[in-house]
């Protein structure tokens, strides 16, 4: 045997190496892979080192006997029959209240002649059962809203306006955003007096009813 090369690397059961006929000089990298249905145990990558030994022990190929974790599904909880998903294991998905399952609620891990075990179906989805409406918002003081409904369908927009002499602070239009539950895109706006005139005009009754001192205020204004 040559004393300037690493030892020959054998083939492994249920797998192969690449390159299949490597140069055995220092720096050579050999990768082992397994046939479908088998997984590498140990290091799949070996390197011929300066001291002409391989960097790792020879790996082996072990039969895959379980399915991968099918994952969580948003808006659901799942019931698992076995924690490591061996062949025969089941995962049941149960959608949260307000959601409905599309697809298969129960997945089963099946063995296959060739290849790794596989789930009976893809993970399902949990969809909104319905688009709930948004409850009507009251009109701002000294303002109005349109339309004046108690319930607004998801996607609908309501518009706000203010009485003459008042200006809108906030969003003039807000949308009923679909969701669980549906909700308004912004808080309702308020109507503020456009000037002090507006402020006092809106309170003229208060002024009339107020004690004498307030008339000085009014006169000063």
């Amino acid at each position: 045997p040559r004393n300037d090369t690493c030892p020959e690397l054998p083939e492994i059961p249920n797998g192969w190496k690449s390159p299949s006929q490597p140069e055995l000089v220092h720096g050579t990298v050999v990768t082992y892979q397994c046939y479908p249905g088998y997984q590498v145990v140990g290091s799949s990558v070996l390197m011929c080192q300066w001291d002409l030994t391989w960097s790792e022990d020879l790996p082996s190929c072990q039969r895959v006997t379980s399915c991968h974790d099918p994952g969580d599904v948003e808006h659901s909880r799942r019931l698992i029959s076995s924690p490591k998903f061996p062949v025969g294991a089941t995962v049941q998905y149960i959608c949260d209240q307000g959601f409905v399952l599309m697809g298969s609620s129960i997945l089963t891990c099946h063995d296959r002649q060739a290849g790794s075990p596989k789930w009976s179906d893809r993970a399902p989805k949990c969809l909104l059962e319905q688009l709930k409406p948004c409850h009507g918002l009251s009109a701002p003081e000294n303002g109005a809203r349109s339309p004046e409904k108690q319930l607004h369908p998801a996607g609908a927009t309501i518009h706000f306006s203010c009485a003459p002499g008042y200006v809108l602070k906030g969003q003039a239009s807000i949308k009923c955003v679909p969701g669980h539950p549906s909700h308004w895109s912004d808080p309702p706006p308020i109507c503020r007096a456009a000037s002090l005139d507006g402020f006092y005009n809106s309170r003229s009754l208060d002024v009339a009813k107020a004690p004498a001192a307030s008339s000085t205020l009014d006169a000063a204004h």
Partner: antibody
């Protein structure tokens, strides 16, 4: 209100790829628990579901057409795009997009008629 | 795939008279959650389909109460208590319980 509008070519040649766009308003394509679907209807015939795309970008296809279809979305533009390869005269149909939740199509676009002819 | 079969194909009705459309599924469309996702759509001439009934018997928002749905398992019916001229079009049943979702072939309602 929730509205959808389809756009795309009126005429495509056999073997070409069809690209259709659905622009939605009144809801976001990222609204959790919702999806948008494409459905088609050949002239004088029944409706056929083609594909769904969900809020989380998961995609489901009609198995009989899966190899020819690709659905995608651009949430920022509120658009869902369907491409269908290797078009044939039998694919002549009105193509609709619709919201999908509650296991039904609640809101539909007005549809776009696509004719496949050389 | 589940096949949805509708009868009749064509239904001529006098305004004010009742109408009934039948839909049969090739297998049970009861969902794993116990509900049945059987819907009815109406496609008026030159328009896109509109949802009338969902989950067998629930009217969608804005649908007049002359429309009603019933049935279970594999047999379902859409009834119109008094047909109006605006009800003309093609009615489709649809199942969403199982993937892929499938439509019936349609029933054309016309005014006599």
């Amino acid at each position: 209100q929730v509205t959808l509008k389809e756009s795309g070519p009126v005429l495509v040649k056999p073997t070409e790829t069809l690209t259709l766009t659905c622009t939605v308003s009144g809801f976001s394509l990222s609204t959790s628990g919702m999806g948008v679907s494409w459905i088609r209807q050949p002239p004088g015939k029944a409706l056929e579901w083609l594909a769904h795309i969900f809020w989380d970008d998961d995609k489901w296809y009609n198995p009989s057409l899966k190899s020819r279809l690709t659905i995608s979305k651009d949430t920022s533009k509120s658009q869902v795009v369907l491409t269908m390869t290797n078009m044939d005269p039998v694919d002549t149909a009105t193509y609709y997009c619709a919201t999908f939740y509650g296991l039904y199509f609640a809101y539909w676009g007005q549809g776009t008629l696509v004719t496949v002819s050389s | 795939d589940i096949v949805m079969t509708q009868t009749p194909l064509s239904l001529p009705v006098t305004p004010g008279e009742p109408a009934s459309i039948s839909c049969r599924s090739s297998q049970s469309i009861v969902h794993s959650n116990g509900n049945t996702y059987l819907e009815w759509y109406l496609q008026k001439p030159g328009q896109s389909p509109q949802l009338l009934i969902y989950k067998v018997s629930n009217r969608f928002s804005g649908v007049p109460d002359r429309f009603s749905g019933s049935g279970s398992g594999t047999d379902f019916t859409l009834k119109i208590s008094r047909v109006e001229a605006e009800d003309v079009g093609v009615y489709y049943c649809f199942q969403g319980s199982h993937v892929p979702p499938t439509f019936g072939g349609g029933t054309k309602l016309e005014i006599k």
